[in-house]
């Protein structure tokens, strides 16, 4: 015998108190599949969470984070604070990058500056807390009498520093 509840579509629930009639989900609740015996409570996006998509009778609300925070976890279950460029998030909050390291993002960790000398190059632009160093030509290319036809090597992109 077919379960009468299987005919109840998404957005309704099978109401045992009313002879298994399909009743619409009450306000602030939803059922995303058919044949449900209860509707689930809608997620509320409060505080640092803000509503990205309103709850409907067939789908839960979706949250994201207010400015200054970013989502973590499945379905944005957590909001982690952003830091400024030149900082990293530690267990004790945002802290400036130590000398010799940089972070050009609002999240992630401080990474060591590129060591130009490992590639036989010189430092063209010094690094900062926010930016990696820019490597220039090798010191030999800069010595007097050296040929000047060789163009300088392209700057290495941040993020390729040795770990």
């Amino acid at each position: 015998l077919q379960d009468p509840c299987s005919n109840c579509p998404a957005g309704t629930f099978c109401d045992n108190n009313r002879n298994q009639i399909c009743s619409p989900c009450p306000p602030n609740s939803f059922s995303s599949a058919g044949g449900q015996r209860t509707c689930d409570i809608c997620r509320q996006c409060k505080g640092v969470f803000r509503t990205r998509k309103e709850c409907s009778s067939t789908s839960n609300a979706e949250c994201d984070c207010t400015p200054g925070f970013h989502c973590l976890g499945a379905g944005c279950s957590m909001c982690e604070q952003d830091c400024k460029q030149g900082q990293e998030l530690t267990k004790k909050g945002c802290k400036d990058c130590c000398f010799g390291t940089f972070n050009d993002q609002k999240r992630g960790i401080c990474r060591p500056w590129t060591n130009c000398s490992l590639d036989g190059k010189s430092v063209l632009v010094n690094g900062t807390k926010e930016r990696d160093v820019v490597c220039g030509p090798s010191p030999a290319d800069l010595s007097p009498g050296a040929s000047s036809v060789t163009p300088p090597a392209p700057a290495r992109e941040p993020g390729h520093s040795p770990q």
């Epitope: 990293e88 998030l89 530690t90 267990k91 004790k92 960790i109």
Partner: nanobody, 124 residues
Framework: EVQLVESGGGVIQPGGSLRLSCEAS????????MSWVRQAPEKGLEWVSS????????YYADSVKGRFTISRDNSKNTLYLQMNSLRAEDTAGYHC?????????????????WGQGTSVTVSS
């Protein structure tokens, strides 16, 4: 697939105690440090406590020091947080988290996997 499943949350009166558990699967549990972090609705994520892979080093946020105790049972792949003398400001979703290496400290934020969390409400 790495999975962390928390349990033990609930509604408790100020001054009360709760013990949270986190069951881990999908990785070699004893090889990684673990943490608890919490998310209060009006605040960003806050680190609570960390424990090394072997369990011999533990660290706590100043706000919970002396009240909360982190521990682990590597034979059961389970992390615990014993919470005593609970206060209204401890109300939050508590998430178990896997760190990226065996060792840990109270500075480097090296978390790569989070559980979905268990809710703790401290209210009279």
């Amino acid at each position: 697939e790495v999975q962390l499943v928390e349990s033990g949350g609930g509604v408790i009166q100020p001054g009360g105690s709760l013990r949270l558990s986190c069951e881990a699967s999908g990785f070699t549990f004893s090889s990684y440090a673990m943490s608890w972090v919490r998310q209060a609705p009006e605040k960003g994520l806050e680190w609570v406590s960390s424990i090394s892979g072997s369990g011999d080093s533990t660290y706590y946020a100043d706000s919970v020091k002396g009240r909360f105790t982190i521990s682990r049972d590597n034979s059961k792949n389970t992390l615990y947080l014993q919470m005593n003398s609970l206060r209204a400001e401890d109300t939050a979703g508590y998430h178990c988290a896997k760190e990226g290496s065996n060792g840990t400290d109270d500075y480097h934020y090296d978390i790569d996997v989070w559980g979905q969390g268990t809710s703790v409400t401290v209210s009279s």
